[in-house]
Interface confidence: medium
């Protein structure tokens, strides 16, 4: 196999008795993308099958990047906090038991949640085998896979790799379609010599050869053209150094009232369980750890506030103090862990010693192709479509990875609007109540009567406001029972939540201006009641009298307006989100400041940006019973995050507006908390850390779109597929490994 | 905490430009989120509101004193001043400046104040 | 303008009574009212903004009530160091105005 050269087979080449292309996933542990790069001319096996069939420059693995959760998460498709393997090592409080890898416990099905894609395949009449896989040996929903092997590491690749092949021999009714294939390396010799070491070069060609050997075997029964084959990893691998430790022992004066999970991904729970689990105080955990010192190498987290495209906080298991540490870093108890030096894993998955290497060939797919990267959840929804089966619900978008097959087998299309949109109308240019605001410039009935008459825009200025500021649609509301307007303006449109007496969404387009100066500072004395929307739907000026700590924050900036007399446009209550002090201070200089740079860079951007409401922290929009509970004596929800979408061309040299091509997104979504104790600015300018608290929390569309309800881009003329990938597109601004 | 301390001149003279300085400490004039304000009493009389200024720069004045009356601000040293033209016997009074907070757009109380400084306009 | 009219004009009151003044606009001026007092030879003092919420370090026997039109600045216990003059004031609309006052006398 390995001396031909690479086979261009438009159809599948399978022999008598294979009617469907088999599947077969290989995991090879820890293999991180770079050594695809480095180390390809010790690799020819692999090296071939990467030049002859697709690759992705990496696959990103899910957070924390560790072996069971990302085995499990490739094979059904959902995030660790959906299908229950939170990391290798756990505590269950309703189960009442402890999970890891060296106990009996891990094969309790009570600990996996989730459909493996074994148990989808032999569901719809296909068999499947596993030659090792998290889970296969686990009797989930009370099934196994129809052939599974218990884990044993010590068995030869070479015999794992025979074992398959006779299992490729079997006679048709009893022949799989599904395969996986485990090896260990070259984790075990990452962990043990680091990344670059002399184990990890020796491990690379041993797999290599047993790689070789199955190609070698799939050639000399003419499969070698009808298996379609996905190599991947789980995750990458990092050095760790016993000079890059920070212990908990440095943080508190005693630390036996709690149990830390320690390492890369460490998490803080109760010593004492399953008594203490629920009083145990974890926001003065939070409290004790933020910003102890200046070059402190690990951020506190209670789970919610992680990043959001992380999706690590939706499960029992997942214990709320999270240490989100640096690379090559670990965080431990006490100098009595050392536990250190060699490599390690389960660090943030967007840094680029975590990414993890994904090869696909066979006749299902493009030859010969480097695709962009992309996550692990996307894999299941793409094996079931090389086995032709319906996929279960799960975390990936499915028909996302389009581009990867010759043919694709499901055609994604844009979802149906469920929610109608109506349009709020201009009545009358006086407003009927004040709402308790402000406007001293516009001191009689005149003035004010010819401010409100720009908000009633005609037909061709609806037009062109809509072209400029709604280059790719407007966002299509895919939440039930919502009633909202759209309110179009000149220099922006907003699609109004009548319940929630706020904008769902704000939308604008920032040209690249010569000027990149920062914005000037908005109107400050002025705020009137929109005539368009009834006074009952409206937020009061007078609700933020109340709170010391919530003021009123602009959805989109009066300052982007550069004549005062078009701020007013923006000066209006259809305008205000409810934001706390300190959070108001990072969205006012990103927009300021920030904003006017990326346009500057990008030929222009359009802006999307509104409020997200996840009290529940599931990763989903709250049903409206969800935030009624959090109201607490306002008529005004706060928000629990606020995201802003940028989006321009691809193509630099056109604005967004005239964008023929492919899009280039930049979206964040910003947990809206009442201090800024995340980014330790006590003492800096915003300069300092406004722009890398923004980066900490960028996130893909898909993560907008699932936390708002919103569906972006239904008019941008492009194939839903492609649509897709950059819905699932995450923006890495990582360099080093 | 923020203190307001006026200086200027105790006695003018008729026609003549009364000048008054409020210096602000403990606090930015800049910072946003609050006007600056100047009131005036007449003897054993009530409060009159002159005028109030912003950091950026736009002020309110009351109509009453409005062609005779400036206020500016000058954030480098931290002061906001009072200019009040062609004055008479009438405007002899105390003269204090305040700070108002701004909540949503709407002007509060005015929380602190100057401790006042007597203008007489006499010749 | 806006004209606010307060009521009484003068009070003698006894300590531990309870004083009420009232402070009328001649129109809606929602809840941007405020109430001040002031002790001869000092500058005023804010007690209550916006109508009825209480400035940080005011003694809690000053509570304040009202929005559109009508105000009342309420003194639970009146004690001795309350003797002042009271003031209110509207912040809705330009020009701000004031109050005549209420000035309140201990017997």
């Known amino acids: 196999w390995l001396e031909e050269n690479c086979d261009t087979a438009q159809q599948s080449q399978c022999p008598e008795g294979f009617d469907l292309p088999p599947v077969i996933l290989f995991s090879m542990d820890g293999f991180r993308a770079e050594y695809l790069y480095t180390w390809d001319t010790l690799m020819p096996n692999i090296n071939k099958l990467k030049t002859c069939g697709i690759h992705s420059k990496y696959m990103r693995a899910m957070y924390p990047t560790k072996t069971f959760p990302n085995h499990y998460t490739i094979v059904t498709g959902l995030y660790p906090e959906s299908h229950g393997i939170i990391d290798n090592n756990m505590y269950d409080v309703n189960l009442n038991k402890n999970f890891s890898l060296s106990s009996k416990e891990q094969n309790n099905p009570a600990w996996w949640h989730g459909q493996p894609m074994w148990l989808t395949a032999m569901y719809q009449g296909l068999k499947a085998a596993t030659y090792f896989w998290p889970g296969s040996e686990v009797a989930i929903n009370g099934s196994f896979p129809s052939i599974y092997m218990p884990y044993n590491g010590s068995v030869p690749f070479e015999e794992r790799i025979s074992t398959l092949l006779k299992w490729l021999d079997l006679p048709k009714a009893e022949r799989p379609r599904f395969y996986t294939m485990y090896f260990e390396e070259p984790d075990s010799s990452g962990h043990a010599g680091g990344p670059v070491s002399a184990r990890v070069i020796k491990a690379l060609q041993v797999v290599d050869h047993a790689f070789g050997m199955l190609m070698e075997g799939l050639k000399q029964r003419n499969l070698h053209n009808c298996v379609n084959i996905i190599l991947l990893a789980d995750h990458g691998m990092d050095q760790t150094y016993c000079n890059k430790m920070e212990y908990m022992t440095d943080y508190f004066p005693r630390i036996n009232f709690f149990y830390m999970y320690e390492g890369p991904a460490p998490r803080i729970r109760a010593h004492n369980i399953p008594h203490d689990f629920f009083s145990f105080n974890s926001e003065e955990i939070v409290r004790n750890l933020s910003c102890r010192k200046p070059d402190q190498h690990f951020k506190p987290y209670l789970t919610p506030d992680l990043p959001k495209r992380l999706h690590y906080a939706k499960n029992v298991r997942i214990d709320k103090v999270h240490l989100f540490v640096d690379q090559q870093w670990l965080a431990v108890r006490s100098k009595s862990n050392t536990n250190c030096g060699g490599g390690n894993h389960g660090y943030n998955n967007e840094f680029r010693s975590m990414e993890a290497i994904f090869l696909a060939h066979g006749p299902s797919f493009k030859e010969k192709t480097e695709v962009e990267p992309f996550e692990n959840i996307e894999v299941y929804n793409l094996m079931c479509d090389l086995l032709r089966i319906q996929p279960a619900p799960n975390n990936g978008t499915h028909g996302s990875l389009n581009h990867l097959l010759k043919v694709p087998f499901y055609e994604p299309s844009h979802a149906e609007e469920v929610s109608k949109f109506s349009v709020c109308g201009f009545a009358n240019p006086l407003p009927t109540e004040s709402l308790d605001c402000f406007c001293p410039h516009l001191q009689n009935s005149t003035q004010l009567e010819q401010v409100n008459q720009m908000l009633n825009l005609t037909q061709e200025e609806i037009t062109a406001t809509v072209k400029v500021n709604l280059p790719f649609g407007r966002p299509r509301v895919l939440q039930k029972n919502v009633d909202h307007c759209l309110l179009y303006h000149r220099e922006y449109v907003s699609g109004f939540g009548k319940a929630m007496r706020m904008p769902m969404w704000s939308s604008y387009t920032v040209p690249q201006l010569g000027d990149t100066s920062p914005l000037p500072p908005t109107v400050p004395d002025c705020l009137r009641a929109d005539v368009r929307v009834p006074p009952s739907e409206s937020q009061k000026c007078s609700f933020y009298l109340a709170d010391k700590n919530i003021t009123h924050g602009f959805l989109y900036p009066p300052a982007s307006n550069r004549t005062s007399d078009s701020q007013y446009d923006a000066l209006i209550t259809s305008n205000l989100v409810p934001m706390y002090e300190e959070f108001r201070k990072m969205w006012d200089y990103f927009h300021s400041v920030l904003l006017i740079k990326h346009a500057t860079e990008r030929n222009g951007v359009n802006v999307v940006s509104g409020p997200i409401f996840d009290y529940n922290y599931d990763g989903h929009f709250d049903a409206p019973d969800e935030i009624t509970k959090h109201l607490a004596n306002t008529d005004v929800p706060i928000p629990t995050h606020y995201f802003v979408v940028l989006t321009s061309c691809k193509n630099k040299s056109h604005t967004p507006e005239n964008c023929p091509g492919w899009l280039d997104v930049l979206p964040f979504i910003i947990p809206h908390r009442p201090t800024n104790v995340e980014s330790c600015p006590e003492g800096k300018p915003e300069a300092l850390w406004v722009e890398e608290r923004f980066t900490a929390h960028i996130a893909r569309v898909r993560d907008v779109e699932l936390l708002t309800g919103l569906d972006f881009y239904q008019d941008k003329v492009q194939p839903v597929s492609e649509i897709l990938q950059l819905k699932t597109y995450l923006p890495t601004f990582e360099t080093t490994i | 905490q923020v203190q307001l301390q006026e200086s200027g001149p105790g006695l003018v003279k008729p026609s003549q430009t009364l000048s008054l300085t409020c210096t602000v400490s403990?606090?930015?004039?800049?910072?946003?989120?609050?006007?600056w304000s100047w009131i005036r009493q007449h003897p054993g009389k009530g409060l009159e509101w002159i005028g109030i200024?912003?950091?950026?720069?736009?002020?309110y004045y009351n109509p009453s004193l409005k062609s005779r009356v400036t206020i500016s601000v000058d954030t480098s040293k931290n002061q906001f001043s009072l200019k009040l033209n062609s004055v008479t016997a009438a405007d002899t009074a105390v003269f204090y400046c305040?700070?108002?907070?701004?909540?949503?757009?709407?002007?509060?109380?005015?929380?602190?104040w100057g401790q006042g400084t007597t203008v007489t306009v006499s010749s | 303008e806006i004209v606010l009219t307060q009521s009484p004009d003068f009070q003698s009151v006894t300590p531990k009574e309870k004083v009420t003044i009232t402070c009328r606009a001649s129109q809606s001026i929602g809840i941007s009212l405020h109430w001040y007092q002031q002790k001869p030879d000092q500058s005023p003092k804010l007690l209550i903004k916006?109508?009825?919420q209480s400035f940080s370090g005011v003694p809690s026997r000053f509570s304040g009530s009202g929005s559109g039109t009508d105000f009342t600045l309420t003194i639970n216990s009146l004690e001795a160091e309350d003797a002042a003059t009271y003031y209110c004031?509207?912040?809705?609309?330009?020009?701000?105005?004031f109050g005549q006052g209420t000035k309140v006398e201990i017997k």
């Open positions: 200024i912003y950091y950026s720069g736009s002020t």
């Open positions: 004031h509207q912040s809705r609309s330009f020009p701000w105005t």
């Open positions: 916006y109508a009825s």
């Open positions: 305040a700070r108002v907070a701004i909540v949503t757009t709407i002007p509060g109380g005015m929380d602190v």
């Open positions: 403990g606090g930015s004039i800049s910072s946003g989120g609050y006007y």
